[in-house]
């Protein structure tokens, strides 16, 4: 699976929140930045996650009319140089400062059952997702016997009208 | 080669059904969200309805919702349009479309050369 | 839901002239944008994908631009064999069709 292209095709700025309205928030600690899932207090302002947005071609056998085979692999950003990260050892998802290019583990597959509503399937760990756990992010081991719309791993990308991330 | 071939068009009372099917090659079918588009004679576009790749997510527009139903199978590559309780404005030749992506409803990359549905008494 | 607006309904212009037609959505939808191009009796196909990304076999006279609700598409040198209606469509919330742009040559 590789990406076809070193740059995005298209960039989308977002707060993002579980299934259940629950808030994605990050915070600096000790020159670290953790994630929480959290309830946030009413109008309190929605942490914003630069969503990066890359064509991937899929090894397959397909051939025709140059459209098949291809995925969508995102990158999430909630702050400058950072990136979510995939730590399959640890099943867990961290922010990692990078620079470019990317390591694989900063690049999900884009699962979306619209109205917003998205899954993010890691690129080094097919069948694995991020979901939440004990409100955290984490690596969940989703079987393909089961539906995608299970809830721990569907998020909701809600626009917002600000044009700066960083 | 992508080939979408729509079946089951035809001349049909208000009030009766319709069951519109698109049989797909060239793809990994089971990878792809599916979706029907509409459009009446001399008219633009209407998306009708989709559904994604593991057929558990099916969507509908407004005017259809409770009448139509759209289903897939994908171990024959096919995908469906039950239309109840037609009427008159469902008139329109209903064209079939694949995703752009795997498992994305983003975009429709591909269309079946469509089949056209009349409703009339 | 959101509401897509073309302008203008018909457009008739040179062989060779740069052409631009326009599409207004009711609401952000973030480069969420597709442009379909539909000939007289023939299926649509894709043109343009998240508002600037030129489908794989389409000649690159073709280019779209655009963010928030404005989006164009801009055929850079319009040729006989562009005669279509021209279609752009949303898909950041449902999905919408614009009413389409009928595109003559004069």
């Known amino acids: 699976m590789s990406i076809t292209g070193i740059s995005p095709i298209t960039e989308y700025l977002a707060s993002l929140s579980t299934y259940n309205d629950q808030s994605i928030t990050f915070a600096l600690e000790d020159e670290s930045y953790e994630i929480y899932v959290e309830d946030l207090k009413k109008d309190e302002k929605k942490d914003k996650v630069l969503l990066s947005y890359y064509e991937s071609q899929h090894p397959s056998n397909e051939s025709g009319d140059g459209v098949d085979g291809k995925m969508l692999m995102v990158t999430l950003s909630p702050t400058k140089d950072f990136w979510l990260h995939a730590n399959n050892k640890e099943h867990s998802v961290e922010l990692h400062k990078s620079e470019k290019p990317l390591p694989d583990q900063a690049f999900f597959v884009l699962h979306n059952m619209h109205s917003n509503s998205v899954s993010f399937e890691s690129k080094t760990d097919p069948g694995v997702f991020i979901g939440v756990k004990d409100n955290h992010l984490a690596l969940i081991k989703v079987d393909s016997s089961e539906n995608l719309s299970t809830e721990n791993i569907l998020f909701k990308l809600s626009e917002t009208h600000h044009h700066h991330h960083h | 080669e992508v080939q979408l071939v729509e079946t089951g068009g035809g001349l049909v009372q208000p009030g009766r059904s319709l069951k519109l099917s698109c049989v797909a090659s060239?793809?990994?079918?089971?990878?792809?969200?599916m979706y029907w588009i509409r459009q009446a004679p001399g008219m633009g576009l209407e998306w009708v309805s989709s559904?994604?790749?593991?057929?558990?997510?099916?969507y509908y527009l407004d005017s259809v919702k409770g009448r139509f139903t759209i289903s897939r199978n994908n171990a024959e590559n096919t995908v469906y349009l039950q239309m109840n309780s037609l009427r008159s404005e469902d008139t329109a030749t209903y064209y079939c479309?694949?995703?752009?992506?795997?498992?994305?409803?983003?975009?429709?990359?591909?269309w079946g050369q469509g089949t056209l549905v009349t409703v009339s008494s | 839901d959101i509401q897509m607006t073309q302008s203008p309904s018909v457009l008739s212009a040179s062989v060779g002239d740069r052409v631009t037609l326009s599409c207004k959505a009711s609401?952000?939808?973030?480069?969420?944008l597709d442009w379909y191009q539909q000939k007289v009796g023939e299926a649509p196909k894709l043109l343009i994908y998240?508002?600037?990304n030129l489908q794989t076999g389409i000649p690159s006279r073709f280019s779209g631009s655009g963010s928030g609700t404005d989006y164009t598409l801009t055929i850079s040198s319009l040729q006989p064999e562009d005669v279509a209606t021209y279609f752009c469509?949303?898909?950041?919330?449902?999905?919408?069709f614009g009413q389409g742009t009928k595109v003559e040559i004069k």
């Open positions: 469509f949303q898909y950041n919330s449902g999905w919408t």
């Open positions: 559904i994604n790749n593991d057929g558990g997510n099916t």
């Open positions: 060239g793809f990994t079918f089971s990878n792809y969200w």
């Open positions: 998240f508002t600037n």
């Open positions: 609401h952000n939808i973030n480069k969420h």
């Open positions: 479309a694949k995703g752009h992506y795997y498992y994305s409803s983003y975009s429709f990359a591909f």
